[in-house]
């Protein structure tokens, strides 16, 4: 038969950060190849990554069409060297992925502090708005465009001479905080989607940036 000795894929896993979305699976192929299909709950199956010997498939182009939809993927196993024939009626072994809703499940990428500027006893800290592959009217959208006010940033800031971290929060990409004159401060930010009730509600922390280094500016 056309699928002799092919093994169904298993451990199908979605890996997604800032909507860049890859489906991974096992096993590493021995004498077999894979094709992936993806669909929304109500849509038609679309094939991707045809007859690949990889164990991953980038499905970003499909899921960014509507990040609030729920997607399902499946991975078909074929013998190595398989060529599609119109006469083949036997369905190859396949495995379904878990359902995946990008808006709810994509991980938040590590944010970056774009700049900070001190004016007297105030510091304005700006978080870089990351671009995604989500499009609207042929324009790529930023993370803020996609999530709107659902996305907040927590700023941790502390005097270089102390260990206690103060916090501030914003649902824009800017913070304006009070600082003590003549003190140097360090900053780190974290992206958060408070409405999520799952482990992926927070990003990892940004790299720490400290006053007196190149990203900052000071004005009296």
């Amino acid at each position: 038969s056309g699928t002799t000795n092919t093994v169904a894929a298993y451990n199908l896993t979605w890996k997604s950060t800032n909507f860049k979305t890859i489906l991974e699976w096992e096993p590493k192929p021995i004498n077999q190849v894979y094709t992936v299909q993806i669909s929304t709950k109500s849509g038609d199956w679309k094939s991707k990554c045809f007859y690949t010997a990889d164990t991953e498939c980038d499905l970003t182009d499909e899921i960014v069409k509507d990040v609030k939809q729920t997607y399902l993927a499946r991975v078909f196993s074929y013998p190595a060297g398989h060529v599609e024939s119109t006469g083949s009626t036997e369905e190859p072994p396949y495995e379904n992925s878990p359902e995946f809703t990008p808006y709810l499940e994509t991980n938040l990428g590590q944010p970056t502090i774009q700049s900070f500027e001190q004016v007297g006893t105030k510091v304005n800290v700006t978080v870089q708005d990351e671009w995604t592959l989500v499009r609207r009217n042929d324009t790529f959208l930023s993370l803020r465009d996609v999530f709107g006010k659902d996305l907040i940033y927590t700023l941790y800031y502390w005097k270089s001479s102390s260990s206690g971290k103060k916090t501030a929060k914003t649902n824009t990409n800017e913070f304006l905080i009070d600082v003590d004159k003549g003190e140097n401060y360090c900053f780190s930010v974290q992206a958060v989607i408070p409405s999520r009730r799952t482990a992926n509600r927070k990003s990892t922390d940004s790299p720490v940036e400290c006053m007196g280094h190149e990203k900052g500016e000071s004005r009296e």
Epitope: Y156, K169, S188, Q190, V192, A199
Partner: antibody, heavy 120, light 107 residues
Framework: EVQLVESGGGLVQPGGSLRLSCAAS????????IHWVRQAPGKGLEWVGY????????YHADSVKGRFTISADTSKNTAYLQMNSLRAEDTAVYYC?????????????WGQGTLVTVSS | DIQMTQSPSSLSASVGDRVTITCRAS??????VAWYQQKPGKAPKLLIY???FLYSGVPSRFSGSRSGTDFTLTISSLQPEDFATYYC?????????FGQGTKVEIK
Amino acid sequence: EVQLVESGGGLVQPGGSLRLSCAASGFTISGYIIHWVRQAPGKGLEWVGYIDPSNGYTYHADSVKGRFTISADTSKNTAYLQMNSLRAEDTAVYYCARDDQSVSSPFDYWGQGTLVTVSS
Amino acid sequence: DIQMTQSPSSLSASVGDRVTITCRASQDVNTAVAWYQQKPGKAPKLLIYSASFLYSGVPSRFSGSRSGTDFTLTISSLQPEDFATYYCQQHYTTPPTFGQGTKVEIK
């Protein structure tokens, strides 16, 4: 169901130490911030400090700085308040509370509290 | 640190009364104010967040409002289960600070 359960309170002599635990269930503490708040008998609420278990960042109120230390063990889903050099004025019910980390950051869930009495 | 000055410290009211409690922040806290209810021997419970948003499961007779640095908790028609102590809290900056509390007693 989200739950916070404090334990470890009791009677301790001035200068002594105590470690309080705050065991969380129904959510993962690394996704939130955990605060400790205390209430002396017949008095109001006083914030003690916080920890972000995802990075270990903490801040302690001036009244306890240098004496109290907040920590967390994400594998146990538990936060801790280590209290050293205890004074009579530390006598209070100690609560842990979850901060949902939204812009307004209300404390949306609280534990039932554990009583710490500092007396000789 | 930001001070939250709450008034009155106590009040007596009857079932059905409209009750108003106020908190004044010593500096701008935007809308980062929450209100809690506490009954004797129990932990505080969240009522209002972001100055005016009713927390899930809280009866609609509770409401919150903001005018500059003044924040108000209103109970439109006091019920027997509402006799308790109420606290405001700012979480605009670290450290978060609480008001002194308002004890609502039966007249």
